[in-house]
Interface confidence: medium
C-alpha cells in the first residue's frame, strides 16, 4: 500500500505563438481545479476507462479575474498535493491523465458551471520511494508543469511497496535475519529472496523474485557473460563499463554449466551450482515439471506432472524463450515512422506519433501546421488534421500567397463605391448614407441613426474600414 502524490507547479500559456485567451474575465470570474486518473501498466486505454490505480480531485484554486487587455498569465493554483492512495503493490509502470477544469463563478442559474480546459496524458516508469520526478506536458496552447512521486505507507517498503516491516520482537534489536526498517526504527525488515537460480555472483535483486544482472552479465539468471570484440585483457571482465569477457584458460570460462547453472572453480576443475529442477555435472539433466512453475512472465505451462515428462511454455505476446524469459524487443526494428515513439506494451505494439502524423505506424502525414508557414503575416491554425491559414488583411488563398481584392465581395452598401486600401478597403458612400460599409441611412432631419458621428466627420465622407 502507498500513495501517489502529484504537485502542480504551474498552468499557463505554453511557449510559442498563439497564446491562449485567459479562461476567466471580469464578467466571468473563475477558478481552476485538477483531476488525476491513474492506471497500472503502460495502458493505451481511452480516457474514459476506469482509473484502476485510483483518482483524485484537487481543491478549488483562488478566484481569478482577468485584467482587460492582459495576456493569459500562469493561473492561480489550488493549495496542496493531489494524493491517490493505492492498496496493493505499486506497479512500477503507470499511465496518467491530468485534467484542468474551470469553474465559472458568474451568475449562472443553478450554481457554478464546470468546463474542461485541458487534458494531458502520459505513460511513465516510477519506483516507489524515489525522489520527485518533474514533468512538463502541453495541451494545445496550454502548458502544465508538475512533479510526482510514489511513496509506501508503513508497514510497506521497497520500490513496489511489497516488502513489509514488522514490529521488533525485542525492543533493542531485530531478530536473526532481520534488518531495521528505515525510517521506522522500531520495526524490522528481512532481506530479499531473489528469483530461484539467480546467480549469487552476478545477479542481485531489489524486489522479491527478481534477478537483476551486474554489468558484464546477462540472461534470466545472470549467468551468461556479455562478450564484446574490443577486449584487451587476457581473461575476465576488463572493466565494469564494458562488461567485456574473453574466453581464456579458466575452467569456468565460457560457462560450462547449462540451464542457468552458476560455475565455480575448484582446484582441479569446476563445479556447477544448478537452479531448481536441474542436476548433473553440467546441470544438463532436467527434472522440471509444470508443478515447479518454470514459465516466467505469465507463460502457460503444458506437460505432465510426473518427473519424466517434459514441459512446454506457451509464451504471452512480447515474450519468447523456452521459459518465456526473454522479452521481445519489437521496438528495436524501429517500426514507427516520421520520428514516432515506439511503445512495446507486451500485448501490442503502439506508436506515439509526432504532431502532424498519424496511423498505426505514424505513416500518414496530416499536412498540419508542423513545418508549414503562412505567407504575408498569416498564422497557421491546426484543426482536424488539416492546416488552415488565417490570413492578414489583403491576402487570401491556402497559404496567404494570393493578394485578395477586398472589393470583390461588394462590401459597400446602398451604392457606395469601394476602393482597395493597403490596410483593407474604403467605402465612399452615396448621398444619404454613412458608416464603414455605408450601412446607416442619414435621417432627413440631419441626425444619423448612430449615436453620433466621430468629430470632424461629415455624413457622406468616405469611411475607412479597418
Amino acid at each position: 500500500a502507498g500513495v501517489f502524490e502529484l504537485q502542480i507547479h504551474s498552468f499557463g500559456p505554453g511557449p510559442g505563438p498563439g497564446a491562449p485567451r485567459s479562461p476567466c474575465s471580469a464578467r466571468l470570474p473563475c477558478r481552476l481545479f485538477f483531476r488525476v486518473c491513474l492506471k497500472p501498466g503502460l495502458s493505451e486505454e481511452a480516457a474514459e476507462s476506469p482509473c484502476a490505480l485510483g483518482a483524485a480531485l484537487s481543491a478549488r484554486g483562488p478566484v481569478y479575474t482577468e485584467q482587460p487587455g492582459a495576456p493569459a498569465p500562469d493561473l492561480p493554483l489550488p493549495d496542496g498535493l493531489l494524493q491517490v492512495p493505492f492498496r496493493d503493490a505499486w506497479p512500477g509502470t503507470f499511465s496518467f491523465i491530468i485534467e484542468t477544469w474551470r469553474e465559472e463563478l458568474g451568475d449562472q442559474i443553478g450554481g457554478p458551471a464546470w468546463s474542461l480546459l485541458a487534458r494531458v496524458a502520459g505513460r511513465r516508469r516510477l519506483a516507489a520511494g524515489g525522489p520527485w520526478a518533474r514533468d512538463i506536458q502541453r495541451a494545445g496552447a496550454w502548458e502544465l508543469r508538475f512533479s510526482y512521486r510514489a511513496r509506501c505507507e508503513p508497514p510497506a517498503v521497497g520500490t513496489a511497496c511489497t516488502r513489509l516491516c514488522r514490529p521488533r520482537s525485542a525492543p533493542s534489536r531485530c531478530g536473526p535475519g532481520l534488518r531495521p526498517c528505515a525510517p521506522l526504527e522500531d520495526e524490522c525488515e528481512a532481506p530479499l529472496v531473489c528469483r530461484a537460480g539467480c546467480s549469487p555472483e552476478h545477479g542481485f535483486c531489489e524486489q522479491p523474485g527478481e534477478c537483476r544482472c551486474l554489468e558484464g552479465w546477462t540472461g534470466p539468471l545472470c549467468t551468461v557473460p556479455v562478450s564484446t570484440s574490443s577486449c584487451l585483457s587476457p581473461r575476465g571482465p576488463s572493466s565494469a563499463t564494458t562488461g567485456c569477457l574473453v574466453p581464456g584458460p579458466g575452467p569456468c570460462d565460457g560457462n560450462p554449466c547449462a540451464n542457468g547453472g552458476s560455475c565455480s572453480e575448484t582446484p582441479r576443475s569446476f563445479e556447477c551450482t544448478c537452479p531448481r529442477g536441474f542436476y548433473g555435472l553440467r546441470c544438463e539433466v532436467s527434472g522440471v515439471t509444470c508443478a515447479d512453475g518454470p514459465c516466467f512472465n505469465g507463460g502457460l505451462c503444458v506437460g505432465g506432472a510426473d518427473p519424466d515428462s517434459a514441459y512446454i511454455c506457451h509464451c504471452p505476446p512480447g515474450f519468447q524463450g523456452s521459459n518465456c524469459e526473454k522479452r521481445v524487443d519489437r521496438c528495436s526494428l524501429q517500426p514507427c515512422r516520421n520520428g514516432g515513439l515506439c511503445l512495446d506494451l507486451g500485448h501490442a505494439l503502439r506508436c506515439r506519433c509526432r504532431a502532424g502524423f498519424a496511423g498505426p505506424r505514424c505513416e500518414h502525414d496530416l499536412d498540419d501546421c508542423a513545418g508549414r508557414a503562412c505567407a504575408n503575416g498569416g498564422t497557421c491554425v491546426e484543426g482536424g488534421g488539416a492546416h488552415r491559414c488565417s490570413c492578414a488583411l489583403g491576402f487570401g488563398g491556402r497559404d496567404c500567397r494570393e493578394r485578395a481584392d477586398p472589393c470583390a465581395a461588394r462590401p459597400c452598401a446602398h451604392g457606395g463605391r469601394c476602393y482597395a486600401h493597403f490596410s483593407g478597403l474604403v467605402c465612399a458612400c452615396a448621398p444619404g448614407y454613412m458608416g464603414a460599409r455605408c450601412e446607416f441611412p442619414v435621417h432627413p432631419d440631419g441626425a444619423s441613426a448612430l449615436p453620433a458621428a466621430p468629430p470632424g466627420l461629415r455624413p457622406g465622407d468616405p469611411q475607412r474600414y479597418l
Epitope: 549469487p200 531489489e206 565494469a240
Partner: antibody, heavy 120, light 112 residues
Framework: EVQLLESGGGLVQPGGSLRLSCAAS????????MSWVRQAPGKGLEWVAA????????YYADSVKGRFTISRDNSKNTLYLQMNSLRAEDTAVYYC?????????????WGQGTLVTVSS | DIVMTQSPDSLAVSLGERATINCKSS????????????LAWYQQKPGQPPKLLIY???TRESGVPDRFSGSGSGTDFTLTISSLQAEDVAVYYC????????FGQGTRLEIK
C-alpha cells in the same frame, strides 16, 4: 575501471558541520546501493550509513542517527554525507563504498578515503 | 546489533604455510529463506582501503587468488590462506550484512 573519489574532509570544531562528497565513475552509479564506512586512526572499520540505488531508502548506524544524512544525485554520479553536530569520536578516515548490487549485498569497491578531524 | 568477534587478534605464520582466521557472530547470519550466509571477508594493507576477498561466506571475489577460501555457516566462519605469500601481510576483517552492518575488530597477519 570502478573509481570512487571522496572529498570534503578537513578540520572542524566540535558541534560543527561538514559535507563529504564521493564522485563515482567507471560503472552505472544509479544501479548500485552505496555506503559510507569510517575508520578511526589505528582502529577498525565502522559502517556509518547506506542508501539504496534510487535514493528512496536510507539506513544509519545508531552512533550517527539524527546527526548524519546520506544522499545521492544519480544525475551527477555523486554520493554525499552531511555531518552535523560533530563530536571528537567522529574523527576518522571516511570511505565511500559501493555494494555489489542492492542494499543487501557486500561492499566490493572502496574509495581511498578522506580524513575528518573534529578537534577544538 | 550483531557483534562480530575475530580470533586471534594477531597471527604470525611462515611463508608457504597455512593461515586460519576465525570469526564468530553473536547471532546467526544465515538467512533461512535463501540459505545464504550474509558474511564477507576483507583485506586491508597499511595506507590502503579494504579489499573484498569473500562474500556469501564462501564465494571468492573475481580476481582474488584461489589460496584464499571462506567456510562456515550460521555463527562460525573461517578465512583460510592455504599458502601464505609475502603480499598477504595485512589486517583481515569479517563483516556481516544481514542485520544492520558490523565488522569484526580485525586480525593482524604477519610473517613469522
Amino acid at each position: 575501471e570502478v573509481q570512487l573519489l571522496e572529498s570534503g574532509g578537513g578540520l572542524v570544531q566540535p558541534g560543527g558541520s561538514l559535507r563529504l562528497s564521493c564522485a563515482a565513475s567507471g560503472f552505472t552509479f544509479s544501479s548500485y546501493a552505496m555506503s559510507w564506512v569510517r575508520q578511526a586512526p589505528g582502529k577498525g572499520l565502522e559502517w556509518v550509513a547506506a542508501i539504496n540505488s534510487n535514493g528512496g531508502n536510507t539506513y544509519y548506524a545508531d552512533s550517527v542517527k539524527g546527526r548524519f544524512t546520506i544522499s545521492r544525485d544519480n544525475s551527477k554520479n555523486t554520493l554525499y554525507l552531511q555531518m552535523n553536530s560533530l563530536r571528537a569520536e567522529d574523527t576518522a578516515v571516511y570511505y565511500c563504498a559501493r555494494h555489489r548490487g542492492g542494499f543487501y549485498y557486500a561492499v566490493d569497491y572502496w574509495g581511498q578515503g578522506t580524513l575528518v578531524t573534529v578537534s577544538s | 546489533d550483531i557483534v562480530m568477534t575475530q580470533s586471534p587478534d594477531s597471527l604470525a605464520v611462515s611463508l608457504g604455510e597455512r593461515a586460519t582466521i576465525n570469526c564468530k557472530s553473536s547471532q546467526s547470519v544465515l538467512y533461512s529463506s535463501n540459505q545464504k550466509n550474509y558474511l564477507a571477508w576483507y583485506q586491508q594493507k597499511p595506507g590502503q582501503p579494504p579489499k573484498l576477498l569473500i562474500y556469501w561466506a564462501s564465494t571468492r571475489e573475481s580476481g582474488v587468488p584461489d589460496r584464499f577460501s571462506g567456510s562456515g555457516s550460521g555463527t562460525d566462519f573461517t578465512l583460510t590462506i592455504s599458502s601464505l605469500q609475502a603480499e598477504d601481510v595485512a589486517v583481515y576483517y569479517c563483516h556481516q550484512y544481514l542485520s544492520s552492518r558490523t565488522f569484526g575488530q580485525g586480525t593482524r597477519l604477519e610473517i613469522k
